[in-house]
Interface confidence: low
């Protein structure tokens, strides 16, 4: 039975050219996390595997950095980065948990939400 819940940074916004941290946290379960996948729509951004550590997709390696923790840092943001991001936790014995984050990249300095996750 899957008892865990995924907490995420929710809907966040950031300025074009800036950086943002996408963060998910799995709680309320003792299941072992074996791998976390980060995806944007159907594109794989990165994985953090318990045995292998981090792997960043080659097409994002210049703009994506692992961490902090199991989170993901997006840099040099463009308006095209606006959209849904998913953290997919593979766990044993529970199975798969998925969290959703919506990122809006703004042209001007009107980013208000998610400031505590933003990198100066």
């Amino acid at each position: 039975m899957m008892t865990g819940t995924i907490e995420t940074t929710g809907n966040i916004s950031a300025e074009k050219g800036g950086s943002i941290i996408l963060q998910c946290h799995l709680s309320s379960t003792t299941a072992q996390v074996t791998q976390v996948n980060w995806e944007q729509q159907d594109q794989l951004l990165a994985i953090c595997n318990a045995d292998l550590g981090w792997h960043i997709s080659p097409s994002f390696k210049d703009r994506v950095a692992p961490g902090p923790g199991l989170g993901l840092t997006l840099q040099s943001l463009t308006v095209n980065d606006t959209g849904e991001y998913f953290c997919i936790y593979h766990t044993y014995p529970d199975g798969t948990y998925t969290g959703r984050i919506f990122l809006e990249v703004l042209e001007s300095s009107v980013a208000e939400h998610g400031a505590r996750f933003q990198i100066p």
Epitope: T34, Q35, L44, I47, D51, H55, H90
Partner: nanobody, 115 residues
Framework: EVQLVESGGGLVQPGGSLRLSCAAS????????MGWFRQAPGKEREWVAS???????WYADSVKGRFTISADNSKNTAYLQMNSLKPEDTAVYYC?????????WGQGTLVTVSS
């Protein structure tokens, strides 16, 4: 039940080639990470290469440029093409996947590089 069955190992001379296969069953292959590890006699098991859905691949520095990992989702099979083999590549090669369990290992296939 997840099952991984490796094949293709054998004895090969230095500079030769081998192609290892890993037939997988019991999970949705194209949603999973697949990889190869190896264990040489008296040494710890070490990661060799991995392939993710979408075809993304990574290699250990020791095999980069010589080994190629690939996956055929329609056949539920992963491959490791090994070229320019060296004596230090001698090991038991294991196929592994991560499908939400700690790890699933095949029985391994022995590769011996010797003249």
């Amino acid at each position: 039940e997840v099952q991984l069955v490796e094949s293709g190992g054998g004895l090969v001379q230095p500079g030769g080639s081998l192609r290892l296969s890993c037939a997988a069953s019991g999970f949705t292959f194209d949603r999973s990470w697949m990889g190869w590890f190896r264990q040489a006699p008296g040494k710890e098991r070490e990661w060799v290469a991995s392939v993710l859905r979408g075809g993304y691949t990574w290699y250990a520095d020791s095999v980069k440029g010589r080994f190629t990992i690939s996956a055929d989702n329609s056949k539920n099979t992963a491959y490791l093409q090994m070229n320019s083999l060296k004596p230090e590549d001698t090991a038991v090669y294991y196929c592994v996947t991560d499908v939400g369990a700690p790890d699933y290992w095949g029985q391994g296939t022995l590769v011996t590089v010797s003249s």
